[in-house]
């Protein structure tokens, strides 16, 4: 969702639903800033490139972040 003039947060709604790491094209973690006071997690799915905002407080999403960072650390030398 595009940004309003004063606030630059992106997500209108956030999802608690588990996401299969294999179905992810990209995972963006946008830290809090002067423009948006909280972290935003935006998942881009492989299928159709559909984006979804994820709930950083959800247990399922926390597990997803762990799985993704584990995968990344495996790949990096």
């Amino acid at each position: 969702i595009p940004l309003s003039r004063t606030v630059r947060c992106t997500c209108i709604s956030i999802s608690n639903q588990p996401v299969n790491p294999r179905s992810l094209e990209k995972l963006e973690i946008i830290p809090p800033s002067q423009f948006c006071p909280h972290v935003e997690i935006i998942a881009t799915m492989k299928k159709k490139g559909e984006k979804r905002c994820l709930n950083p407080e959800s247990k399922a999403i926390k597990n997803l972040l762990k799985a993704v960072s584990k995968e990344r650390s495996k790949r990096s030398p």
Epitope: I1, C9, I12, S13, N16, C36, P37
Partner: antibody, heavy 120, light 108 residues
């Protein structure tokens, strides 16, 4: 099950104010954006306003910008629409609707609507 | 602002017949179109999203198709409860989110 109950409508004179409310239940309210959509008598649907799950993002239709304010109270599962400087053309049934929780907006559940009549 | 034009304005059909409703966008909206059904005195109900996905609890006789600027809602065999007004809506990623003017499906 998901339920949205709209209230606060009535007959009001031009230039006056009215506050609509929407009580939500049956879902995790504080993760969903909420919208107001209106329908003038015998006419089609017009999107009015949206508020994000945390109340930070707010957008308005040009026709109501500067006159209407959307707010929410996540502790009470409520959304409100404060309507000021009302005009005859604001006469409509006002529906509160839940955001689809997808990147691209659609409305997956709707309230029953509350009628606002602006007339002198 | 994206304008949606629905046709025809009214469709007069008998139960059991096939209904084909059209929605045309003033510019490409990819596959981001939703369809709603509204009966007199009731709130709209989501039928189809992303052009072709049926919402929860919607019967298989309702189907959607199309992409870009041209979209179609098809009711394969009209049931008595399907006579209503149908609206399309574009799901762009920026407001305002607009609706078509509606197509009324009435009993012939």
């Amino acid at each position: 099950q998901v339920q949205l109950v709209d209230s606060g409508g009535g007959v009001v004179q031009p230039g006056r104010s009215l506050r609509l409310s929407c009580a939500a239940s049956g879902f995790t309210f504080n993760t969903y954006g909420m919208h107001w959509v209106r329908q003038a008598p015998g006419k089609g649907l017009e999107w009015v306003a949206v508020i994000s799950y945390d109340g930070i993002i707010k957008h308005y239709a040009d026709s109501v910008k500067g006159r209407f304010t959307i707010t929410r109270d996540n502790s009470k599962n409520m959304v409100h629409l404060q309507m000021n400087s009302l005009r005859a053309e604001d006469t409509a049934v006002y529906y509160c609707a839940r955001d689809s929780s997808s990147w691209y907006v659609y409305f997956d559940y709707w309230g029953q609507g509350t009628l606002v009549t602006v007339s002198s | 602002e994206i304008v949606l034009t629905q046709s025809p304005a009214t469709l007069s059909l008998s139960p059991g017949e096939r209904a084909t409703l059209s929605c045309r966008a003033s510019q490409s909206v990819s596959s981001y179109v939703a369809w709603y059904q509204q009966k007199p005195g009731q709130a709209p109900r989501l039928l189809i999203y992303d052009a072709s996905n049926r919402a929860t609890g919607i019967p298989a006789r309702f189907s959607g198709s199309g992409s870009g600027t041209d979209f179609t809602l098809t009711i394969s065999s009209l049931e008595p409860e399907d006579f209503a007004i149908y609206y399309c809506q574009q799901r762009s990623n920026s407001p305002p989110w607009t609706f078509g003017q509606g197509t009324k499906v009435e009993i012939k």
